[in-house]
């Protein structure tokens, strides 16, 4: 039961994936692929990093965050309905079976005819760094977690946002937890 992310046609989609480098600049190869993570590789690769840099990418797919600090979240530019589906983020940690595999489901919705009210803004747009997946593979469940740099004020703000959010039920159903610290 992979975590679901949403975007509208014509918008940019954001698929979160993070790791913590052992030391600054000590990067780990990461690949993003369209389709669920296979046993060793990344499916149909759309972007790949090595120990130093992004060494392969395709149009519309890019890393908006600081990948040198472990933010390897994928941005897909100007999405269409064809971009819907499962995406694989694979963090290729050296060693024996150390890979972290994340399957993320992207749902693309038709563009709204009228803009949504301000309070109904997209959760992932309002709090893009709050959505992160924890390690899993086939037949494992994912949970949502938070990064350690979120303070109590942000948590309170987040709770207010969630109260009216379209995603509140989705987060509850996927076993979301907000961790402080």
């Amino acid at each position: 039961s992979e975590v679901e992310y949403r975007a509208e046609v014509g918008q940019n989609a954001y698929l979160p994936c993070f790791y913590t480098p052992a030391a600054p600049g000590n990067l780990v190869p990461v690949c993003w692929g369209k389709g669920a993570c296979p046993v060793f590789e990344c499916g149909n690769v759309v972007l790949r990093t090595d120990e130093r840099d992004v060494n392969y990418w395709t149009s519309r797919y890019w890393l908006n965050g600081d990948f040198r600090k472990g933010d390897v979240s994928l941005t897909i530019e100007n999405v269409t309905l064809a971009d819907s589906g499962i995406y694989c983020c694979r963090i290729q940690i050296p060693g024996i079976m150390n890979d972290e595999k994340f399957n993320l489901k992207l749902v693309i919705k038709p563009a709204k005819v009228t803009p949504a009210p301000t309070r109904q803004r997209d959760f992932t747009a309002a709090f893009p760094r709050m959505l992160t997946t924890r390690g899993h593979g086939p037949a494992e469940t994912q949970t949502l977690g938070s990064l350690p740099d979120i303070n109590l004020t942000q948590i309170s703000t987040l709770a207010n946002e969630l109260r009216d959010s379209r995603l509140a039920n989705d987060l509850r159903d996927s076993g979301a937890t907000i961790r402080i610290g």
């Epitope: 780990v28 669920a36 296979p38 046993v39 060793f40 290729q92 050296p94 079976m97």
Partner: antibody, heavy 119, light 111 residues
Amino acid sequence: EVQLVESGGGLVQPGGSLRLSCAASGFTFSRYAMSWVRQAPGKGLEWVAAISSGGSLYFPDSVKGRFTISRDNAKNSCYLQMNSLRAEDTAVYYCARGREADGGYFDYWGQGTLVTVSS
Amino acid sequence: DIVLTQSPATLSVSPGERATLSCRASESVEYYGTSLMQWYQQKPGQAPRLLIYAASNVESGVPARFSGSGSGTDFTLTISSLQSEDFAVYYCQQSMKVPLTFGGGTKVEIK
């Protein structure tokens, strides 16, 4: 044309070590997972090691702690270091290329190299 | 580990006849709608050759008389009309989980 050529097999005593090499050509080696699969005389196939394009390592319990796999993308080569060899490790060892984007099955194989563990 | 059981161990078939080989997995190899099962052919003194991947996809260059089917735990390799070059040992293999595992093989021999 894709080619995989194994070398390094031979006769070794129980407890000994051996290093097998696989020289690859005809494809962009760094993009593919590579595996070693063995076949004991008159027996079936057994997967023994894999290394992903990113360098992650995978082994079955039967060889974990005794075998290790490595790759040198600059030399288009993959290696299987076998330590603490046992009689039951006697087999033909094949180097195999994992299918691109997956790695978990094998679209090209080498001709194999025979490893005999005997005193 | 996922155990693959192939049957029969030996299949005696006349040239031109149809051959049906079975592979049963100890647990499902379905993953996001794909069956992670492959079939290989091996002739004496040769390396294995990939025939079928993801249960039913025929590898490039493999004759159309080879086909694969099945899902979940039960899979079948069918050779519609056996040719002399098809007499060999056939192995199934799962790529669902590490360790990757092979079936024990089915030997297809001339009747």
